[in-house]
Amino acid sequence: VTGSRVYPANEVTLLDSRSVQGELGWIASPLEGGWEEVSIMDEKNTPIRTYQVCNVMEASQNNWLRTDWITREGAQRVYIEIKFTLRDCNSLPGVMGTCKETFNLYYYESDNDKERFIRESQFGKIDTIAADESFTQVDIGDRIMKLNTEIRDVGPLSKKGFYLAFQDVGACIALVSVRVFYKKCPLTVRNLAQFPDTITGADTSSLVEVRGSCVNNSEEKDVPKMYCGADGEWLVPIGNCLCNAGHEEQNGECQACKIGYYKALSTDASCAKCPPHSYSVWEGATSCTCDRGFFRADNDAASMPCTRPPSAPLNLISNVNETSVNLEWSSPQNTGGRQDISYNVVCKKCGAGDPSKCRPCGSGVHYTPQQNGLKTTRVSITDLLAHTNYTFEIWAVNGVSKYNPSPDQSVSVTVTTNQAAPSSIALVQAKEVTRYSVALAWLEPDRPNGVILEYEVKYYEKDQNERSYRIVRTAARNTDIKGLNPLTSYVFHVRARTAAGYGDFSEPLEVTTNTVPSRIIGDGANST
């Protein structure tokens, strides 16, 4: 992008090809067929002056490109940052013997700022530059390119200025940006270790050792030291200061974490509030303890809330169809505070004479969509044995269930396969409707297909659309549904159960609670 660009404070730019207005006009050798100046558009539709070469079909390429003269401004060591894009030789057909994926960087010191020709012998090699990532054709989007950035340094320099040169030996390459800069050592205070202002050394071998001092309640493995190098950068500290565990940085000091807060490690992080369902009872805590009955899973970070296993699934409903069973249930009332809830199905085959003698069903039974790790609240179980008692347990599990497994996390139902379930109930009536209750009555199914053990009434508010239903079971052919809301439409379904399992639910009966008691006879359809 044209115009000035922002760089780190310790870097002084001597050349930036992206800041040059108009053509760069660098010198290429040969004049034609080698490096070529090309204008491309960046993501802001601003032209960028680049140099490209792609002589990949013929061996022994030797194409040179030289910058204009660059003043040294007293710097003894300079840095060259090259942003370039290199095309993968594999993306160019039929050039494997001749295509290269590197180029060479050279420099030449001179007091003459107007040298017109490239004399290769005058140049000293800085390095061979290779790409971290080359790209195939499909990697270039609408002017979004994979750019490689390589930085090299050269010195000590002594003349007034210098030229840079780029030698292509047969690559498909574009120089998108060339920046030359030198560095000044900045004043710094780092990691709770104080380092005074320091002047850089005279050459590459002279490093100025600087000792830092740690603040209170911080620790050092070794004495904190940094070296100010000739490149104007502080080199990586030998030792460093960090606030101790249980302490945090505040205004350049290390203070103890308050009660209810913690910090686990000697890091530069702040103290954090104890996550939900955990606590600390002293200042300077390094961890928080989970409340009784709450746990952390192995992969839960110390910063995550403590959680607990879920309660049992609700409203387990079974439908037997010969040697298949469909089970459906509602989510647990309490998920334990976790999102990773799933369901496991346990199938037990039980003796007819003694239901307590149950054995695992084995691998012959099939579950749809699966037996364990169910994310949905329904499962189909097939390939059961005929005329057999089965007990199915639905376990709600989450990431901490293993720490406190309990029968409270499961709900079970016992069914018998291969017996016909009762037919549906044809007529359900609302005998009495009050503000808070509905008295229901119904007839026995036309085809009981055995002894009816009980009836199950499922009801829900009409506008809830069966999202949240309730179940009432009764041995009689009538029941009072209490605890309803006044002036609310409810939908009721009834079904019968025999030893063979449940029949189908009746047609819905819609009843609206009222403010004055009245007797209403339902006809199995809507009633208000």
Epitope: V56, M57, G97, Q137, D139, I140, D142
Partner: antibody
Framework: QVQLLQSGAEVKKPGASVKVPCKAS????????MSWVRQAPGQGLEWMGW????????TYAQGFTGRFVFSLDTSVSTAYLQISSLKAEDTAVYYC??????????????WGQGTLVTVSS | EIVLTQSPATLSVSPGERATLSCRAS??????LAWYQQKPGQAPRLLIY???TRPTGIPDRFSASGSGTDFTLTISRVEPEDFAVYYC????????FGQGTKVEIK
């Protein structure tokens, strides 16, 4: 000055063969691949394939295998297109075009003036 | 084989007006697309490669954009010498041309 020079028009009978030359000048012949493009009268452009002028290895487009052969004579910087068993539907202008690979993309940057091949009994 | 569809087939513009030509690929070609200009009785001329890069010598009134399947060639102010047929061409493993758009005088 970079240019590709093709021969004049050819009139051939069905079943005959024709060899269309394309002479390159102004650049190193073996440094750029050569493409061949067909344009039937009043129709659009059809890419026939290309030849690596350094290795002599040809690549043919779908529909241009068998009767069509690309060849080179690097000593005279010339590429050739030979068509055998000519048919009436081969009547077209045949262009040679220099292939340019770049970092930013590829294209055919220099074209011959075209050779009209007419197949008629 | 990747099919390139150009639209419109014919574009009528007056000199000085802006012309916008479209090229759509049957599957993504990334930025591997070139544009050519062909005048009657002449060989085609390369206008754009890499979807948006102009070779040296092509006037800056020609610009292009796009990637994937949708590409556009724009002539900002049509000059008399710009009336011609324009072809797009993709260069994947096999190269194909579009059927062409004729830019004619209104």
């Amino acid at each position: 000055q970079v240019q590709l020079l093709q021969s004049g028009a050819e009139v051939k009978k069905p079943g005959a063969s024709v060899k269309v030359p394309c002479k390159a000048s102004g650049y190193t012949f073996t440094s750029r691949a050569m493409s061949w493009v067909r344009q039937a009268p009043g129709q659009g452009l059809e890419w026939m394939g290309w030849i690596n002028t350094n290795t002599g290895n040809p690549t043919y487009a779908q529909g241009f295998t068998g009767r069509f052969v690309f060849s080179l004579d690097t000593s005279v910087s010339t590429a050739y297109l030979q068509i055998s068993s000519l048919k009436a539907e081969d009547t077209a202008v045949y262009y040679c075009a220099r292939v340019r690979f770049t970092v930013y993309g590829d294209g055919m940057d220099v074209w011959g003036q075209g050779t009209l091949v007419t197949v008629s009994s | 084989e990747i099919v390139l569809t150009q639209s419109p087939a014919t574009l009528s513009v007056s000199p000085g007006e802006r012309a916008t030509l479209s090229c759509r690929a049957s599957q993504s070609v990334s930025s591997n697309l070139a544009w050519y200009q062909q005048k009657p009785g002449q060989a085609p001329r390369l206008l754009i490669y890499g979807a948006s890069t102009r070779p040296t010598g092509i006037p800056d009134r020609f610009s292009a954009s796009g990637s994937g399947t949708d590409f556009t060639l724009t002539i900002s102010r049509v000059e008399p010498e710009d009336f011609a047929v324009y072809y797009c061409q993709q260069y994947g493993p096999s190269w194909t041309f579009g059927q062409g758009t004729k830019v004619e005088i209104k």
